[in-house]
């Protein structure tokens, strides 16, 4: 089995997590992709997903999460803007490939959001928020629900890194259609 690894990001409230998930172009360019959070003892929970089929460079926004699938780069870009302490947790990108089980893209992201001023004098991320002005045509895709006899009932153990995941539930504003999706390695 492939060893599960994590990449840790420690950010301040109000900052933006901006990560890219690399995938095989030929296999997955138009496949529907999702961003999930993994809570201890629970199945991964889908927070946002692209359309089906996934459209090239077409932003999908769910609350403070923005997904953009760049087929020509073979990259799913995930941005979580205006981070809150409650966003801390373990995240992953997956590709839906029915009727097969979802395919996880490495590595998982261990996000730690702390309170405190994130900038330096003269620095203001709010002044750059036009980056996240999503056009009116932005759609929120409906994420599919998968059933499988090999349902995950136990999330992987916490990272051995010196970070811990808060027990409080994630609080993402305006997030709807959140469903549980089993993920398999």
């Amino acid at each position: 089995a492939t060893k599960l690894t994590e990449e840790k990001y420690e950010l301040k409230e109000g900052q933006t997590l901006d990560v890219k998930c690399d995938y095989t172009l030929e296999k997955f360019a138009s496949s529907q992709k999702a961003w999930q959070i993994i809570r201890d003892g629970e199945m991964p929970k889908t927070l946002a997903c692209t359309e089906r089929p996934s459209k090239n460079s077409h932003p999908v926004q769910v609350g403070r999460i923005i997904l953009e699938d760049y087929h020509d780069h073979g990259l799913l870009r995930v941005r979580m803007v205006n981070l809150q302490v409650e966003d801390s947790g373990l995240y992953q990108c997956v590709i839906y490939q029915p009727p097969k089980e979802p395919h996880m893209l490495f590595d998982r992201i261990r996000l730690v959001v702390t309170k405190g001023f994130s900038g330096t004098p003269g620095s203001n991320e709010n002044s750059t928020q036009n980056v996240y002005k999503i056009p009116p045509t932005t759609t929120k895709a409906l994420c599919p629900l998968y059933t499988s006899p090999r349902t995950v009932t136990q999330a992987p153990p916490k990272s051995t890194a010196d970070v811990s995941t808060p027990d409080s539930e994630i609080n993402l504003t305006n997030v709807t259609d959140i469903i549980r999706v089993p993920v398999f390695n």
Epitope: E7, L11, Q15, T16, D18, D72, G74, L75, F106, T128
Partner: antibody, heavy 119, light 108 residues
């Protein structure tokens, strides 16, 4: 332990060619993007080229576009940089670097190999 | 291309003192910034990424802050092994990935 070992550098005349190799170990090579970064003598760092892991997408700095070609052999855990039409200004130490899975930042570097272009 | 500008070019500091290095981006890179340390004859070493996350094994005296276009690397109490050249790098959008010209931290 992650290790990256470059080879293939040397002295070459302007207009000549060289092929650099970077043998890696200690991580699942095929999963990660890799880059070449160079440093001219006494100067700063300059990103040269990148090849993604899963997608295989390639990117180049304008200064080397059309002359350099990046490639990888996942079965050999090796990254390559084919350098053609070399110029004096290509003289530098060339480092191969492993990238994060989630972003193009360089968490592991090789020790570098020196390329000298001179007549 | 995003241009990264570091200041000062050289910083003279006594051991035990605090060092503050600056990096400015020509356009916003949000938090997509990394800092590297390079000693003579050695390859660069990743110190900070995501503007403020310390890389594995990096001592707590190194800290990063900033977002958007202005970033700071702070070394709270300089040790002898910290005298080196420091580079910032943006990884915001698509290549080219660009570095600052470097700040040399030397013994005062």
């Amino acid at each position: 332990e992650v290790q990256l070992l470059e080879s293939g550098g040397g002295l070459v005349q302007p207009g000549g060619s060289l092929r650099l190799s970077c043998a890696v170990s200690g991580f699942t090579f095929s999963r990660y993007a890799m880059s070449w970064v160079r440093q001219a003598p006494g100067k700063g760092l300059e990103w040269v080229s990148e090849m993604r892991g899963s997608s295989g997408s390639t990117y180049y700095a304008d200064s080397v576009k059309g002359r350099f070609t990046i490639s990888r052999d996942n079965s050999k855990n090796t990254l390559y940089l084919q350098m053609n039409s070399l110029r004096v200004e290509d003289t530098a130490i060339y480092y191969c670097a492993k990238e994060f899975s989630s972003n193009s930042l360089f968490d592991y570097w090789g020790q570098g190999t020196l390329v000298t272009v001179s007549s | 291309e995003i241009v990264m500008t570091q200041s000062p070019a050289t910083l003279s500091v006594s051991p035990g003192e605090r060092a503050t290095l600056s990096c400015r981006a020509s356009q916003s890179v949000n938090s997509n910034l990394a800092w590297y340390q390079q000693k003579p004859g050695q390859a660069p070493r990743l110190l900070i990424y995501g503007a403020s996350t310390r890389a594995t094994g990096i001592p707590a005296r190194f800290s990063g802050s900033g977002s958007g276009t202005e970033f700071t690397l702070t070394i709270s109490s300089l040790q002898s092994e910290d005298f080196a050249v420091y580079y910032c790098q943006q990884f915001y959008n698509w290549p080219p990935w660009t570095f600052g010209q470097g700040t040399k931290v030397e013994i005062k």
